[in-house]
């Protein structure tokens, strides 16, 4: 699987799971969330040469015209494949509100 | 939804699904099925700013993410949303067998 | 240019639900939470709730007794207020304000025009 | 739920003239060194206008004839060289607590 597992630990150059450190205020301009400041919200990035991860039979089918036509601008992309949720605080004047964020952090990539 | 309908009649420079025609023999080397000779397959193709078709949590985050840091590689990738299955007819021997396959036509695009 | 345009006036019958747009341009919707604030006829601001739009998150005045809803639709850029179980009470003028952007509970710095809700049998 | 109270409920003032409005809170909007207090203009037909940010701050745009001071409970909007397009509804906000009140308004 091209986890964080494999990928952080590799120096693999077809798609697989990246760092990446969001900062809320600065990155994303949320100033109002409390805790955390920031997270590793990670990314997708790589080829995808034909056989690497792909996710449906079209990406299969992608991958190999893709081969057949190395020019084209047809080809799958590295995207996120599993999602982990964030929790956050934040303040509601004085009072504090936790929620679980969903879908915010990548663990694997897939080429679809 | 950037579908068939409105990506097919609109010169949109964003995220859509495009036209591609795959020829099973020329373009992928499948000489075996009889019929279709090949399909529209179409793909997916253009960049995905913020608010475009954004599909998870995640996806908003880093759009803008990268509303922020211009220069940054993460960035969320324009691939398939909705597919659908292509019929084929090969022979086994002087058998005709009709075999539908899943996933081999992009209706529509998202931003993942 | 920051521009918050609201749906046009309402006349709604005692009991029934109504539903005001506000359709955001000039600046990044999902940065920002949206505030509603109701002022009926002659009278002062009644601040009603709020919604973060990038993931829907939500905080009500619990004055509203969970009649009102708010949502976003980040793919347009608009924020929805519905107010269910309309009574006399409820004719107002509602507005949508932007949140200053520093804390979820804020000043709001941007404003649409107003939609006035009239409930009338 | 914190309860503002405003000052005169009503007020005319000639022009050049300086106008004070007060706000009181039903108890403290400071916290974390900052006093959480805005003031709003409602001019006739519109909607309202953000003048003052967290107690003292001049909102961008407007005029530096207005100025706000204060802080704990009692605060204050001072105008200076009182103009006709100062007409309105003058308004202020807490969001130190939930759910956010504003004042009743000073005409």
């Known amino acids: 699987a091209l986890d964080t597992n494999y990928c952080f630990s590799s120096t693999e150059k077809n798609c697989c799971v990246r760092q990446l450190y969001i900062d809320f205020r600065k990155d994303l301009g949320w100033k109002w969330i409390h805790e955390p400041k920031g997270y590793h919200a990670n990314f997708c990035l790589g080829p995808c040469p034909y056989i690497w991860s792909l996710d449906t039979q079209y990406s299969k089918v992608l991958a190999l015209y893709n081969q057949h036509n190395p020019g084209a601008s047809a080809a799958p992309c590295c995207v996120p494949q599993a999602l982990e949720p964030l929790p956050i605080v934040y303040y509601v004047g004085r009072k504090p509100k936790v929620e679980q964020l969903s879908n915010m952090i990548v663990r694997s990539c897939k080429c679809s | 939804a950037l579908d068939t309908n409105y990506c097919f009649s609109s010169t949109e420079k964003n995220c859509c699904v495009r036209q591609l025609y795959i020829d099973f023999r020329k373009d992928l080397g499948w000489k075996w099925i009889h019929e279709p000779k090949g399909y529209h397959a179409n793909f997916c193709l253009g960049p995905c700013p913020y608010i475009w078709s954004l599909d998870t949590q995640y996806s908003k985050v880093l759009a803008l993410y990268n509303q922020h840091n211009p220069g940054a590689s993460a960035a969320p990738c324009c691939v398939p949303q909705a597919l659908e299955p292509l019929p084929i007819v090969y022979y086994v021997g002087r058998k005709p067998k009709v075999e539908q396959l899943s996933n081999m036509i992009v209706r529509s695009c998202k931003c993942s | 240019e920051v521009q918050l345009v609201q749906s046009g006036a309402e006349v709604k019958k005692p009991g029934a639900s109504v539903k005001v747009s506000c359709k955001t341009s000039g600046y990044t919707f999902i940065t920002y939470w949206m505030n509603w604030v109701r002022q009926a006829p002659g009278a002062g601001l009644d601040w009603m709730g709020q919604i973060f739009p990038a993931w829907g998150s939500t905080n009500y005045n619990e004055m509203f007794e969970g009649r009102v809803t708010l949502t976003a639709d980040t793919s347009t850029s608009t924020a929805y207020m519905e107010l269910s179980s309309l009574r006399a009470g409820d004719i107002a003028v509602y507005y949508c304000?932007?949140?200053?952007?520093?804390?979820?509970?804020?000043?709001?710095?941007?404003w649409g025009q107003g939609t006035l809700v009239t409930v009338s049998s | 739920d914190i309860v503002m109270t405003q000052t005169p409920p009503s007020l005319s003032v000639s022009p050049r003239e300086t106008a004070s409005i007060s706000c009181r809170a039903s108890e403290s909007v400071d916290s974390y060194g900052n006093s959480f207090m805005h003031w709003y203009l409602q001019k006739p037909g519109q909607s309202p206008q953000l003048l003052i940010y967290?107690?003292?701050n001049l909102e961008s745009g407007v005029s530096d004839r207005f100025s706000g001071s204060g802080s704990g409970t009692d605060f204050t909007l001072r105008i200076s060289r009182v103009e006709a397009n100062d007409t309105g509804v003058y308004y202020c906000?807490?969001?130190?607590?939930?759910?956010?009140?504003f004042g009743q308004g000073t005409k």
């Open positions: 967290l107690a003292s």
């Open positions: 304000a932007r949140g200053y952007g520093n804390y979820a509970l804020d000043a709001m710095d941007y």
């Open positions: 906000q807490q969001n130190d607590e939930d759910p956010l009140s």
